[in-house]
């Protein structure tokens, strides 16, 4: 039967080395065997490149395309092929569809004055445009109480958050995760980082009396 795209490709760029496109076919498809996504930068002399998609689900395909360090002017021509049949054609401007890389190495350290210091790494090298543009969201949740969670917006430059132990339940196990976004690029949120877990051993003041 004929091959059809149900949901056309949606693409995002990490604005440093990779763009990812995802789309849904109208029936279960072996993406890597049946489809190819070609991409070409709209720039004089550019070559046509081919991405072999992988299955994310039965009918969902995803393609990861290596790109050069992105700049605002970059526009790619995208063509989705099933053999000789052109299924979809469109353009993609990475600077207009940014999904930042996931922050890394989230750690929790006890700090002075009954505070926890949460630290993570900025996923971009200092020379990249996004390095100084990221703000973060930190989610802290009680592992045993789904109602007990807090969300912190980190809008200052440093990838750190100081958390008063007294704001958390004593003796409870907590998990934290972090994600990033770039306001000036009107980006989407990054994926969440892996969680890190710790025991909040702060002793409330009343227990000392």
């Amino acid at each position: 039967g004929s091959v059809k795209v149900l949901h056309e490709p949606s693409c995002f760029s990490d604005y440093i080395s990779t763009s990812v496109c995802q789309w849904k076919m109208d029936h279960p498809t072996n993406c890597s065997a049946e489809l190819r996504l070609s991409y070409q930068l709209d720039f004089m002399g550019s070559e046509n490149h081919t991405c072999v998609p992988e299955n994310r689900e039965d009918s969902v395909c995803v393609c990861s395309m290596p790109i050069d360090d992105a700049v605002e002017a970059d526009v790619y021509q995208l063509d989705l092929w099933a053999g000789q049949q052109l299924l979809w054609s469109g353009s993609f401007q990475p600077s207009k569809h940014v999904k930042p890389r996931t922050p890394g190495n989230l750690t929790v350290h006890p700090n002075i004055s009954h505070t926890w210091l949460l630290m993570w790494t900025n996923p971009y090298p200092t020379e990249n445009h996004l390095h100084s543009e990221l703000t973060y969201m930190v989610n802290v949740s009680n592992d045993n109480d789904p109602e007990d969670f807090k969300v912190y917006n980190v809008t200052y430059m440093g990838p750190t958050l100081r958390l008063a132990a007294s704001t958390l339940k004593s003796g409870a196990s907590y998990s934290a995760r972090v994600r990033a976004w770039a306001q000036t690029y009107n980006s989407t949120w990054s994926d969440w980082s892996p969680s890190t877990t710790w025991l909040n051993y702060y002793e409330p003041w009343e227990q000392h009396l």
């Epitope: 720039f43 004089m44 002399g45 550019s46 070559e47 046509n48 490149h49 050069d68 700049v71 002017a73």
Partner: antibody
Amino acid sequence: EVQLVESGGDLVKPGGSLRLSCVASGFTFRDYAMTWVRQAPGKGLQWVSLINGSGGKTYYADAVKGRFTISRDNAKNTLYLQMNSLRAEDTAVYYCAVDRKTKTIRPQYYGLWHWGQGTLVTVSS
Amino acid sequence: DIVMTQTPLSLSVSPGETASISCRSSQSLTYSIGYNYLDWYLQKPGQSPQGLIYLGHKRASGVPDRFSGSGSGTDFTLRISRVEANDTGVYYCMQGLQSPLGFGQGTKLEIK
């Protein structure tokens, strides 16, 4: 050492055809776009055409569009310019030159970083 | 099409002096910050052209540092300091950003 050697220039009548060749050595030919530039007697430089490294994309000056065809044979490290329906105003020295590196996603640009010695095309009755 | 305009069309300079050639484009040649697709070439009498400057300011291999390029957007300048007799020839600017590529009319440099 990078070398470009053009050949094929000749005296040809208006309406005639000619094929120029440019043999390259000393660099990875398939990784680079190649360009033809011409220079009419006593005049300035005029860009003619460009072809990317794979040969999949070509570009032409309006003055030659539809009459000239640029091509390449990467196995032979050779660039070609097929010139049809030649006119008196096509009389010029034709140079081939190495252009941008197109192997990367965004071509790496170094200008026209090496030129051949040129071959003379004369169109006259 | 992008039109390239060079000034002056001819220039006479004494050895040891500095020569400046201007090139203006009808559209911006800036693709991104630091990437201005403007080159300078020298054609010495009876020879093929040779590259001097690319991307507005980068010297081609083997080009002496007496040659320098500057500018961005639509206005560019080639400066030749401590001019030598060997610098005689016609200097061309060229835009390499989009098809059709285009050269300026050329500037003839004569050494007094």
